[in-house]
């Protein structure tokens, strides 16, 4: 019987509000033994895959997806999935990347810490939430 794969988690360094032209790194985490991590934006059809997987702890592996110079087109909802043979996991929660014009003001920090791992509430009417998952065989429209 195939094991039930835990859902991955996703976070962003240094945060989820990034000034135009700055860098951001998405960190996807899953169990040990992951062969491929996939970072999706908005839809399964827009993704990047990596097999550059490192061990983050004895029970956890991770992959890092870096965008060197963030553009407005990088804004959106991101999530991770992974492939641990012989199957794909379910999707992580979504993480929203906001791209803002640099203000440089001392009282307004450029970034906010961002991660998305646990369950979220069902969207209320004013929710700024949306939903999507893992996929094989779709043509990649690369993120960056």
């Amino acid at each position: 019987q195939e094991e039930d794969l835990p859902r991955p988690s996703i976070s962003a360094e240094p945060g989820t509000v990034i000034p135009l032209g700055s860098h951001v790194t998405f960190v996807c985490r899953g169990p040990v033994g992951v062969q491929t991590f996939r970072l999706e934006r908005d839809s399964r059809s827009t993704y990047n895959d990596t097999e550059d997987v490192s061990q983050a702890s004895p029970s956890e592996s991770e992959a890092r997806f870096r965008i060197d110079s963030v553009r407005e087109g990088n804004a959106g909802l991101y999530r991770c999935i992974y492939y641990k043979p012989p199957k794909w996991s379910e999707q992580s929660d979504y993480l929203e990347l906001l791209v803002k014009e640099s203000s440089g003001g001392p009282d307004s920090p450029d970034t906010e810490p961002g991660s998305s791992a646990g369950p979220t509430q069902r969207p209320s009417d004013n929710s700024h939430n949306e939903h999507a998952p893992a996929s094989q065989g779709l043509k990649a429209e690369h993120l960056y």
Partner: antibody, heavy 119, light 107 residues
């Protein structure tokens, strides 16, 4: 709070039409809006989506050449349709799509607007 | 393009009984699946999202399961009001594909 479609009606074959999805009591900020149609006696058929978080548009392969989804304001999304044929006769729905965790939630549907293509 | 195959196309069941509707995705869609109920002249009504999460206000007689490519909707303790057409849908905004529907008749 609701979304309402308008702009349907009777159109001649090869004609064009623009449908509007208007939010009432909320704006579409950071949601996605999708258009779905349903021909008489048939099942729903996805047409296109507009993502407010990324400003990206997504289309069913059959719809790409004749349908255009656009955001016209924070409370309005339109669907432009060209070269219409009898096969496009259907009720057209817009749906507001939120997120729940890592999955999308198509929870709010308008009542639909009927488009009839006939000479 | 992703295809959602729904079975059976129609089913008849008795009040108080149980029905199971299956939906198969042509590619792995993880948990991105919703189930809808539709009655004539109305838009689809969301019953279940994320494959197994019950929409607010929907009776617990409705349940969903599955992940990846195989999904199931189960309706137990059937009532006359459950007579309708049921659809599965891939909820990804880049796909949005619906199954062909299952017409449920209550006898």
């Amino acid at each position: 709070e609701q979304s309402v479609e308008s702009g349907g009606g009777l159109v001649q074959p090869e004609g064009s039409l623009t449908l509007t999805c208007k939010a009432s009591g909320f704006d579409f900020s950071r949601n996605a809006i999708c258009w779905v149609r349903q021909a008489p006696g048939k099942g729903p058929e996805w047409i296109a989506c507009y993502s407010f978080s990324s400003s990206a548009t997504y289309y069913a392969s059959w719809a790409k050449s004749r349908f255009t989804i656009s955001k016209t304001s924070s409370t309005t999304v339109t669907l432009q349709m060209t070269s219409l044929t009898a096969a496009d006769t259907a009720t057209y729905f817009c749906a507001r799509v939120d997120i729940y965790g890592g999955s999308r939630y198509w929870g709010m549907w308008g009542p639909g607007t009927l488009v009839t293509i006939s000479s | 393009e992703l295809v959602m195959t729904q079975t059976p196309a129609s089913v008849e069941a008795a009040v108080g009984g149980t029905v199971t509707i299956k939906c198969q995705a042509s590619q792995n869609i993880g948990g991105d699946l919703a189930w809808y109920q539709q009655k004539p002249g109305q838009p689809p009504k969301l019953l279940i999202y994320r494959a197994s999460t019950l929409e607010s206000g929907v009776p617990s007689r409705f349940s969903g399961s599955g992940s990846g490519t195989e999904f199931t909707l189960t309706i137990s303790d059937l009532e006359c009001a459950d007579a309708a057409t049921y659809y599965c849908q891939d909820t990804d905004i880049g796909s949005g594909a619906f199954g062909g529907g299952t017409e449920l008749e209550i006898k």
